[in-house]
Interface confidence: low
């Protein structure tokens, strides 16, 4: 009954509105409904238009699919055509009053199937279902895997592929570990995979600017170094430096009324030269203060070097030696002065004798037949030397003596003429000036070294050669070279070094051997007034400790490279320093700053004195050592 | 001799990203020893560190930045580059890339310099 | 506010020495020898003229030289020249291993 209703509305609509032209109330007839006539009267107005002798050519390209007024105006009420559904998208598509529906292919939606159903994100189905990758297609879609793995037979999970076991050569020599999805070609810490030679090579880490300062590259690791010598340290990070830093405040207050007689290891203090009226005799005043036992105080000469006067210190005592034309002596005499006091110290050439006074009280005497210098053309010229000799007058000495003399001088008047403009010259020069307060021991400012030649081999010991160290010491920065056994070849075949622990305020002592830390003993309050006894023997068989908090042995299994490269070492030639290391590379030893601090050294049965070294910077103060720092000083 | 030429937009947006590229020529940028490095200098003068790169992929960068740089490498054009996010009008100074020896914290070739404003 | 302070401007008449002065603290500059000094001719490329504090790279005029002490650097440059005019930035490694420069020093040649 509908298809002939329909076929009934065709027939009217031909007649009245194909063959004769319709209005709206004409064709609402036809229709006999409003939505439908509402939707067809503006289309066939269009319709009309278009087939008006082409005139509304705009208008006109809505019609193009039509070929004549008859089947563009029988089209307008089929909703189904032109087709409104998406093509890709709809099965079928049903004709309705002004409306149309259509219906979808699986996996499209929408009022015109024109919308893909995005199965990858149906929440009732995550992921479509896929273990990896969902692709959505249009209408469909499909799983896939990532690279590395592949598809099972239900097309929805994925299985990892092992590299390693389908290419065993695939990283040359390197290792290969499977990973999921993927392989990794690994190499030792310390190297990096190169893909052309499938092999592992050595990473060169310095050129990375791993260290702060200095970097020593070796296969598979790389080390840093800091420059001791300059004061620095390795920070705990193993990579940057740090400053190191005084852990026991010293006194080094200065007076430039103080004469230090100790500012060159070898050399004269200060050179005097006096033009007084011949009837001038030879004096000598002032204060002294050491706690070395032998130097020279003072060498007085005649212009010609013909006649001299030398004051000195022998075992703690005051000594003098003279020559001139009519005689030479040697007298020592008086009570032992290198006691740390100041002692006055006073020598006057009399008419006939010259006398050495000790606190105002006459000590010595010595007979004399004419005066000590002659003077000449109405004059006496005299030079006057303090703390060393002018030249080489060893030969000329009466009885030899080791120069170096580590002590102070003060309000002194030499020639009955005052300071005379000395106190000036002194005041300008720094290091010519003594410190206010010392103690007894040798200084190590941390700025320089003492070398001594000691063989320690013992032809009567069955061991062949040891090294017996006893080292009092009291440190004033927590990291330094105290002890160090050098070799021709530049290698540190032995070293015993102080290092800032990782523990607040204490220091750990290590003991090296080249640049391999062979024992390290931990956590000793060192930086203290008090001053710590530590003692080291060693053979080519055993380590022997002894520490304040420690006494231990470790023997030969332990140690069985180190103590063979230590043995190689002491066969050949070393030499001793102390206080640090002479120039050898940052790499030699664990350790490379300079010892700061108070130390004496013992080495088998021998006390060091540093006057007698080799060589010693200057600023080492051999038998002297600032007090500890006291907040309420008096300076 | 070594040369190097810093090339990008002279005028960024704030909010943006300035982009700048190093172009490295009578040397290549994968050889041992060298870092590429980035400084700025502000109108008012003063030179400021951006960060360095290794050929190898190692970055180095100020750390008041770090949240918003990101250096580069591409070995095979022989370049190196620069992204700097969100940029104020702070950032508006001239661009430097220069050549930083492994050696120390020296940077012994620098290029002419490309001045980039940030202004909307 | 640059990590390094420098004079704003010095300047010297032809012939004369001058000293740039660099003060740091003991992070940077007094902690350590990585020490550099760069001239910069407005619109050129900057030039590095001292290295480690005191040394010269190949190809630099030995009338400029370079010292530190404690937290100061400097940078003297002797028998002045008008074609040392230009500005002087000095840079120093840091703890925290980054790179730092100073203000920038602007020598006027008399």
């Known amino acids: 009954a509908n298809s002939m209703l329909e076929e009934t509305k065709q027939g009217n609509l031909e007649r009245e509105c194909i063959e004769e032209l319709c209005n709206k109330e004409e064709a609402r007839e036809v229709f006999e409904n409003d939505p439908e006539t509402d939707y067809f009267y503006p289309k066939y107005l269009v319709c009309l238009r278009s087939f008006q002798s082409g005139l509304f050519t705009a208008a006109r390209q809505s019609t193009d699919a039509y070929p004549d007024l008859r089947s563009c105006v029988n089209a307008i009420p089929d909703q189904c055509s032109p087709l409104p559904c998406n093509e890709d998208g709809y099965m079928s598509c049903k004709d309705g009053k002004a409306s149309f529906t259509c219906t979808c292919k699986p996996g499209w939606q929408g009022e015109k199937c024109e919308f893909d159903i995005n199965e990858c994100k149906d929440p009732s189905n995550i992921n479509g279902g896929c273990s990896q990758i969902c692709d959505n297609t249009p209408g469909s879609y499909h799983c896939s895997c990532k690279s590395g793995f592949v598809m099972l037979s239900n097309k929805k999970d994925c299985k990892d592929v092992d590299e390693c076991s389908l290419k065993p050569n695939m990283c040359g020599t390197a290792v290969c570990k499977n990973i999921p999805g993927d392989f990794e070609c690994e190499c030792p810490e310390g190297y990096r995979y190169n893909l052309k030679s499938k092999s592992c090579e050595d990473v060169d880490e310095c050129s990375e600017n791993m260290c702060a300062q200095l970097c020593v590259n070796y296969p598979g690791g790389y080390t840093c170094y800091c420059d001791g010598k300059k004061g620095f340290k390795l920070a705990q990070d193993q990579k940057s430096c740090e400053a190191v830093s005084v852990c026991l405040p010293l006194n080094l207050d200065t007076k430039y009324e103080l004469l230090y007689l100790a500012e060159q290891f070898a050399g004269v203090v200060l050179y005097l030269k006096f033009r007084l009226p011949e009837i001038s005799r030879f004096s000598a005043e002032f204060d002294f203060r050491t706690y070395d036992s032998q130097g020279v105080i003072l060498y007085a000469e005649s212009i010609d070097h013909s006649a001299w006067l030398l004051i000195a210190l022998r075992g703690g005592k005051i000594e003098v030696q003279l020559k001139n034309e009519h005689t030479s002596k040697i007298t020592t005499g008086g009570d032992i002065i290198n006691n740390g006091l100041w002692n006055m110290v006073s020598v006057e050439e009399l008419e006939h004798s010259i006398s050495i006074k000790i606190a105002k009280e006459a000590v010595m005497d010595i007979n004399k037949p004419g005066p000590l210098f002659k003077p000449e053309n109405g004059l006496l010229e005299t030079k006057v030397y303090f703390a060393g000799f002018p030249r080489k007058v060893e030969s000329e000495l009466i009885k030899p003596i080791n120069p170096r003399l580590d002590g102070c001088i003060r309000s002194w008047n030499l020639m009955k003429q005052g300071a005379s403009g000395i106190k000036e010259i002194i005041q300008e020069k720094q290091n010519k000036h003594c410190l206010v307060t010392v103690e007894k021991g040798s200084y190590y400012p941390g700025s320089g070294i003492a070398e001594f030649h000691i063989d320690y081999n013992n032809g009567s010991n069955a061991e062949g050669w040891h090294i017996n160290v006893t080292l009092n010491i009291r440190p004033s920065m927590g990291t330094g070279v105290m002890l160090a056994l050098v070799s021709s070849n530049n290698t540190v075949p032995f070293a015993v070094s102080l290092v800032d622990s990782t523990s607040e305020k204490s220091q750990d002592i290590v003991i090296s051997v080249e640049n391999t830390v062979i024992y390290r003993i931990q956590a000793l309050s060192l930086c203290s007034n008090q001053r710590s006894h530590l003692e080291f023997r060693v053979n080519r068989n055993n380590l022997e400790l002894l520490t304040p908090l420690k006494i231990e042995t470790i023997s030969q299994e332990e140690l069985q490279t180190q103590l063979a490269i230590l043995d190689k070492a002491m066969k050949g030639k070393v030499a001793t320093y102390l206080g640090g290391l002479p120039d050898v590379p940052f790499s030699a030893t664990p350790v490379n700053a300079f010892y700061n601090g108070c130390m004496e050294v013992n080495i088998n049965g021998v006390e060091l004195d540093l006057d007698e070294a080799i060589s010693k910077h200057n600023d080492i103060r051999a038998h002297s050592c600032p007090s500890v720092w006291k907040k309420t000083k008096n300076s | 001799q070594v040369q190097l030429q810093e090339s990008g937009p002279g005028l960024v947006k704030p909010s943006q990203t300035l982009s700048l590229t190093c172009t490295v020529s009578?040397?290549?940028?994968?050889?041992?020893?060298?870092?590429w490095s980035w400084i700025r200098q502000y109108p008012g003068k003063g030179l400021d560190w951006i960060g360095y790169?290794?050929?190898?992929?190692?970055?180095y960068y100020n750390p008041s930045l770090k949240s918003r740089v990101t250096i580069s490498v591409g070995t095979s054009q022989n370049q190196f580059s620069l992204k700097l996010i969100s940029v104020t009008a702070a950032d508006t100074a001239v661009y430097y890339c220069?050549?930083?020896?492994?050696?120390?914290?020296?940077?012994?070739?620098w290029g002419q310099g490309t001045l980039v404003t940030v202004s909307s | 506010q640059s990590a390094l302070t420098q004079p704003a401007s010095v300047s010297g008449s032809p012939g004369q020495s001058i000293t740039i002065s660099c003060t740091g603290t003991?992070?940077?500059?007094?902690?350590?020898?990585?020490v550099s000094w760069y001239q910069h001719h407005p619109g050129k490329a900057p030039k590095l003229m001292i290295y480690?504090?005191?040394s010269r790279p190949s190809g630099v005029s030995n009338r400029f030289s370079g010292s530190k002490s404690g937290n100061t650097a400097s940078l003297t440059i002797s028998g002045l020249q008008a074609e040392d005019e230009a500005d002087y930035y000095c840079?120093?490694?840091?703890?925290?291993?980054?790179?730092?420069f100073g203000g920038g020093a602007r020598l006027t040649v008399l």
């Open positions: 003991s992070s940077d500059v007094g902690g350590y020898e990585f």
């Open positions: 220069a050549r930083r020896l492994s050696t120390g914290p020296y940077f012994d070739y």
């Open positions: 009578g040397g290549s940028i994968t050889s041992d020893g060298y870092h």
């Open positions: 840079s120093s490694y840091t703890r925290s291993s980054t790179v730092v």
């Open positions: 480690d504090v005191s």
């Open positions: 790169i290794y050929y190898t992929g190692n970055t």
